[in-house]
């Protein structure tokens, strides 16, 4: 069985204030069973950006349909970027557990930084 890899191809993403940013994340295996969440930052201070299973994340949309059984693309779009959005974003695979899911593997991260202002 192939070991799961979390692929975030862009190390750096330059974004424009007010625009939409696309953060890419694909996985190489459907196993283990469990959700993929997005965070900004690492460690206990990390900020939850998107959780497909619970919560309401109005500025975030998924690129693919996460409800499809064989989906391996967990990329997201964040709309209406502000300066407070800068930071490094990680897609993180969790293994289904009881009562709590357990963090399994993190992508390498994509740093979001502000590029040129809109003309």
């Amino acid at each position: 069985e192939e070991e799961l890899q979390m692929i975030q191809p862009e190390k750096l993403l330059l974004v424009t204030v007010g625009k939409t940013a696309t953060l890419h994340c694909t996985v190489t295996s459907l196993l283990p069973v469990g959700p993929v969440l997005w965070f900004r930052g690492v460690g206990p201070g990390r900020e939850l950006i998107y959780n497909q299973k619970e919560g309401h994340f109005p500025r975030v949309t998924t690129v693919s349909d996460l409800t499809k059984r064989n989906n391996m693309d967990f990329s997201i779009r964040i709309s209406s970027i502000t300066p407070a959005d800068v930071g490094t974003y990680y897609c993180v695979k969790f293994r289904k557990g009881s009562p709590e899911n357990v963090e399994f593997k993190s992508g390498p991260g994509t740093e979001m930084a502000l590029g040129a202002k809109p003309s």
Epitope: L48, E54, P58, S80, A84
Partner: antibody, heavy 119, light 108 residues
């Protein structure tokens, strides 16, 4: 329906401590950043502190830094504000407020808890 | 730090007479501005977010406009129950979150 109910307010002397609680219901508490905002008698709204969804990331207004500690227990759907070394100028109604998403406005407010610091 | 200045401090209007409240930011906040209403003895309530979007359950007599540094909250035909203090809040740069000083609206 979203509900936020503060408790723990009261009258204390300068230098004493108090802990406020905010019981949350009607939403996925662990998915949202939470805040404390206060309002001195006859005055406007002053943001006090913020805690991220996981509880490991905190921010404070300069006026309370080093004296107040925000925390949360996601298993109990409860937000806390530990207030030490209280001063007369901390006298206010303290509101807990839910954030719409991690980088956003406050969409729901509690009813408030009155803290009076007086000798 | 971004400072929000609201004007006027007090606004007295007759029922049905248009009320216009202003909020000015010391630097651009894009469209990241919300308006909250606070009636006497009550907690604040969200009215408008992202400068112009009405929150759930807010009557359409309330509208918001503006971007950058200048924002307006309009009550097209005020009712007596609209007597309250109105606060703007920016969430473009934080921490700290900032509120304006408030505008007290009195319905004659």
């Amino acid at each position: 329906d979203v509900q936020l109910v503060e408790s723990g307010g009261g009258v204390v002397r300068p230098g004493e401590s108090l802990r406020l609680s905010c019981a949350a219901s009607g939403f996925s508490f662990r998915s949202y950043a939470m805040n404390w905002v206060r309002q001195a008698p006859g005055e406007g709204l002053e943001w006090v502190s913020r805690i991220n969804s996981g509880g490991g990331g905190t921010d404070y207004a300069d006026s309370v830094k080093g004296r107040f500690t925000i925390s949360r227990d996601n298993s109990k759907n409860t937000l806390y504000l530990q207030m030490n070394s209280l001063r007369a100028e901390d006298t206010a109604v303290y509101y807990c407020a839910k954030q719409y998403d991690w980088n956003s406005f406050f969409d729901y407010w509690g009813l408030g808890a009155l803290v009076t610091v007086s000798s | 730090e971004t400072v929000l200045t609201q004007s006027p401090a007090t606004l007295s209007v007759s029922p049905g007479e248009r009320a216009t409240l202003s909020c000015r930011a010391s630097q651009t906040v894009g469209s990241k501005l919300a308006w909250h209403q606070q009636k006497p003895g009550q907690a604040p309530r969200l009215l408008i977010y992202d400068a112009s979007n009405r929150a759930t359950g807010i009557p359409d007599r309330f509208s918001g406009s503006g971007s950058g540094t200048d924002f307006t909250l309009t009550i097209s035909s005020p009712q007596t129950e609209d007597s309250a203090v109105y606060y703007c809040q920016q969430y473009y740069y934080w921490p700290p979150y900032r509120f304006g000083g408030g505008t007290k609206v009195e319905i004659k």
